[in-house]
Amino acid sequence: VPRWRQQWSGPGTTKRFPETVLARCVKYTEIHPEMRHVDCQSVWDAFKGAFISKHPCNITEEDYQPLMKLGTQTVPCNKILLWSRIKDLAHQFTQVQRDMFTLEDTLLGYLADDLTWCGEFNTSKINYQSCPDWRKDCSNNPVSVFWKTVSRRFAEAACDVVHVMLNGSRSKIFDKNSTFGSVEVHNLQPEKVQTLEAWVIHGGREDSRDLCQDPTIKELESIISKRNIQFSCKNIYRPDKFLQCVKNPEDSSCTSEI
C-alpha cells in the first residue's frame, strides 16, 4: 500500500539532487586549490544529514553545523559582494572581477545555488514531489534555513568596505524581507565593517534618476547608520556598459574625456 505523502506548496527536490551536489563539489575543489583537501563524499553525507528523516518544517541552523564545518572557507573579507534580487549581474561581475566574491562563489553557496531539496519525517527518502514553500507552508524548511545559515556566516565574515548590488527596477529597491535585508544587513560586524556601499542597478536605458534617493535606500541607510557602519550609494546607470568597462577598463569609452 503506498504511503500517504505530505503535499507541500513548493516545487519538489531538484532531480538528481545527490549527484548534482556531489558533482559540483568535485568540480569546485578541482578549480579552487585552497579547497582541494575537502572530501566531497563527507560533504554530501553532512548535507544529507541536515534534512533526511527530518520534518521539512522543523529544520534548524544546528542541523547544518556539520556541513558548515566541512565547508569552512576563508574568502578575503574585504572583497565581499552581496546582492539582492539581481543575482545574475552580481555573478557576471565576479566572473570578470575574480578577486571579488558572492556567496555563490564559495563552496557551500556553489553547491546549493538554484537547487531545492527536502526530506520526510522518519523516512530516508528525498521528496521529489513537493517541498515547503516559505510563505505558504513554513519558514523553517531545509532550503530557507540553509540560505539563512550560510548568508549569516558570510555577512559575519565581511570587513572594511562591503558592496551590495540592488535591483533599481524593483518597487522595493531595498526589501527588508529579502535575505539581504533580514539576515545579512543585521550580521555585518560594526567593529570590522567600515562602510556598506550600495550599487543601485538601473534597468531602463534612459533612466537617469538618482535612485540613491529612493525611500527604501534611505531606510537601508538608516538601519546601517544605527549599526555604526557608514553608508555609501552609487547609481549604475548602464549595467551593460559597466560590465564592459570592468572587463576592459583601458577602453577609451570607460574614462571621462578631459
Epitope: 538618482d210 568597462c245 577598463p249 574614462t255 571621462s256
Partner: nanobody, 119 residues
C-alpha cells in the same frame, strides 16, 4: 560616507610644487580610471588629470608637462604631483572616479583640498 579623503594642499608661491594625495576606499576606485578635478571660485568643476587602472594617463592642456598623476592600488591612493604652479591653478582639488557619468554616478565627493598659489 568618507570614501574619498584628499590631502596635501596648501599655500605656495608661483613656481613652487605640491603633492596631493587621495585615499579612496571601495572596489569602484580600484577597477576604474581615477581623476583629479578642481574647482576655482565661481567656476565649474573641471577634470585635470586621469589615470586608468593600467596606469595610462591623460592631462588637461593647461597642466600638461607640469602635473603628474599616479596611483598605488595596494594602498588605495591616487597622487597628483604639481610642479611649476601658477596663480591660475588656485582651486579646491578633488579626486574621484573618472568614468563617464552616464555609466556610474560620481555622487560621493570628498571634502577636497585647497591649493592657493600666490604671485
Amino acid at each position: 560616507q568618507v570614501q574619498l579623503v584628499e590631502s596635501g594642499g596648501g599655500l605656495v608661491q608661483a613656481g613652487g610644487s605640491l603633492r596631493l594625495s587621495c585615499v579612496a576606499s571601495g572596489i569602484i576606485f580600484r577597477i576604474f580610471s581615477m581623476g583629479w578635478y578642481r574647482q576655482a571660485p565661481g567656476k565649474q568643476r573641471e577634470l585635470v588629470a586621469t589615470i586608468t587602472s593600467g596606469g595610462n594617463t591623460n592631462y588637461a592642456h593647461s597642466v600638461k608637462g607640469r602635473f603628474t598623476i599616479s596611483r598605488d592600488d595596494a594602498k588605495n591612493t591616487v597622487n597628483l604631483q604639481m610642479n611649476s604652479l601658477k596663480p591660475e591653478d588656485t582651486a579646491v582639488y578633488y579626486c574621484n572616479v573618472a568614468i563617464p557619468s552616464g555609466i556610474v554616478d560620481r555622487s560621493a565627493w570628498g571634502q577636497g583640498t585647497q591649493v592657493t598659489v600666490s604671485s
